[in-house]
């Protein structure tokens, strides 16, 4: 797609295999694990990235699997089923025929069941709250400067339309970034907030999916902004369906 002929790579996704076998000898890149052709001028979908991550050698996986008491996405990594467009299939199952329903960012939204479990539709995650804590600094960051830097990051690095960054909240040392994108708002070609949030999550953990310059260089008026922990909360257009047993 966009990789130059002389060195066929995918700028937006390290987890690809590329070769100059596209039309006219153009570079074509396919995601590891699925073999799906990806558009290297934009973000790769989270589903294809998770699948690629699970197909990589175990020692290449640097993240620790969250334990069962983690607040968010507490199922951790799994090998997802993706549709031909790279979206998560509504129903996911593991090798032992345990199945569950997921939302558009691949997070479980029902209790686990068996192969008879039905997931009628892929429910869209329309609101993502990214909760960050930054490392101690001499003083608090100026809120408007911090807001501008983070909005610029999502616009430039992830190519997320500015209208989808709903708000940036700050109470030192906690920063919250709110992403909102309803089904009706997302036009063809728009980056999905779930994909942008996943790329951001990997970036702040020092596991950038981009080739080239590498990691983030977040600065507010020249002062480095270093993130020491991240939590991401997902809100779906239709509330999740968990039994009361899970809530107690």
């Amino acid at each position: 797609h966009t990789a130059a002929q002389d060195n066929c790579t995918c700028p937006t996704n390290k987890m690809t295999v590329c070769s100059p076998d596209g039309p006219g000898g153009r570079c074509q890149c396919r995601a590891l694990g699925s073999g799906v052709a990806v558009d290297c001028s934009t973000l790769t979908s989270k589903c294809l990235l998770l699948k690629a991550r699970m197909s990589a050698p175990k020692n290449a996986r640097t993240l620790v699997r969250p334990n069962e008491h983690a607040l968010v996405d507490n199922d951790g990594l799994y090998d997802p089923d993706c549709d031909p467009e790279g979206r998560f299939k509504a129903r996911q199952c593991n090798q032992t025929s345990v199945c569950w329903c997921v939302n558009s960012v691949g997070v479980r939204r029902t209790d686990k069941g068996d192969l008879s479990l039905r997931c009628d539709e892929l429910v869209r995650t329309h609101h993502i709250l990214i909760d960050l804590r930054h490392r101690p600094t001499a003083g608090a960051f100026n809120h408007s400067d911090l807001d501008a830097e983070l909005r610029r990051l999502f616009r430039e690095r992830y190519r997320l339309h500015p209208k989808f960054v709903a708000a940036v909240h700050y109470e030192q040392p906690t920063i919250q970034i709110e992403l909102r994108q309803n089904t009706s708002q997302k036009a063809a070609g728009d980056v999905d907030i779930g994909d942008a949030a996943y790329y951001f999550e990997r970036d702040v953990k020092g596991e950038s999916l981009f080739q080239g310059r590498g990691g983030l260089d977040l600065r507010v008026r020249g002062e480095p902004l270093q993130v020491e922990r991240t939590l991401i909360y997902y809100l779906d257009e239709i509330p999740p369906k968990f039994s009361m047993k899970r809530l107690t």
């Epitope: 990789a3 066929c8 570079c27 310059r213 600065r219």
Partner: antibody, heavy 126, light 105 residues
Framework: AVTLDESGGGLQTPGGGLSLVCKAS????????MFWVRQAPGKGLAWVGV????????NYAPAVKGRATISRDNGQSTVRLQLNNLRAEDTGTYYC???????????????????WGHGTEVIVSS | ALALTQPSSVSANPGETVEITCSGG???YGWFQQKSPGSAPVTVI????YRLSDIPSRFSGSASGSTATLTITGVRVEDEAVYFC??????????FGAGTTLTVL
Amino acid sequence: AVTLDESGGGLQTPGGGLSLVCKASGFDFIDYDMFWVRQAPGKGLAWVGVINRSGSYTNYAPAVKGRATISRDNGQSTVRLQLNNLRAEDTGTYYCAKGVCTHCWDADSAGNIDAWGHGTEVIVSS
Amino acid sequence: ALALTQPSSVSANPGETVEITCSGGSGNYGWFQQKSPGSAPVTVIYNNNYRLSDIPSRFSGSASGSTATLTITGVRVEDEAVYFCGSADSTYVGLFGAGTTLTVL
């Protein structure tokens, strides 16, 4: 308005070194990447290199790699190009340029340049 | 790739629409106008399709895959210039095209 003023050009001897300085004004210098681009007489534009806003990252064209160093002083709003072991083919007009996309995964791209200096002429000759 | 690929020249009558293409880059494209050799380039389009506020609205840019297009809708005599495209290769080295000379007949 954005202003970029280059200085330090002139007649240089082969094998010697030059130091070009670009003084920036009219924008928050600390927030933007800076580029150097050159143009040989009668030829097209050629990307020389880039420095990110903090000065922690630089990238150079193969033609100058190992001979060029780009540095910046955010306090003085200046960016410098040091070019050593000069050759006749280094002759041309050197432009300082402002980047617009410091977070982009393709931030080094010439497609991110939004403002240019007037240029300073360098002649390498014995 | 040592340079981006663009046509060496295009010509048009005043009022016509002109398209100049550029291919072979990886990442953002920009378009730069140079009215005479040795004069400073002027950015017409950056980041594929962003136009600076002092650039007339008849200039527009688009990009699809590894090809970018500069469109001048209703070309004028004062648009006569050499237009360079800029991007990068996949090793993140910046690149320019050799330039397209626009002649307004």
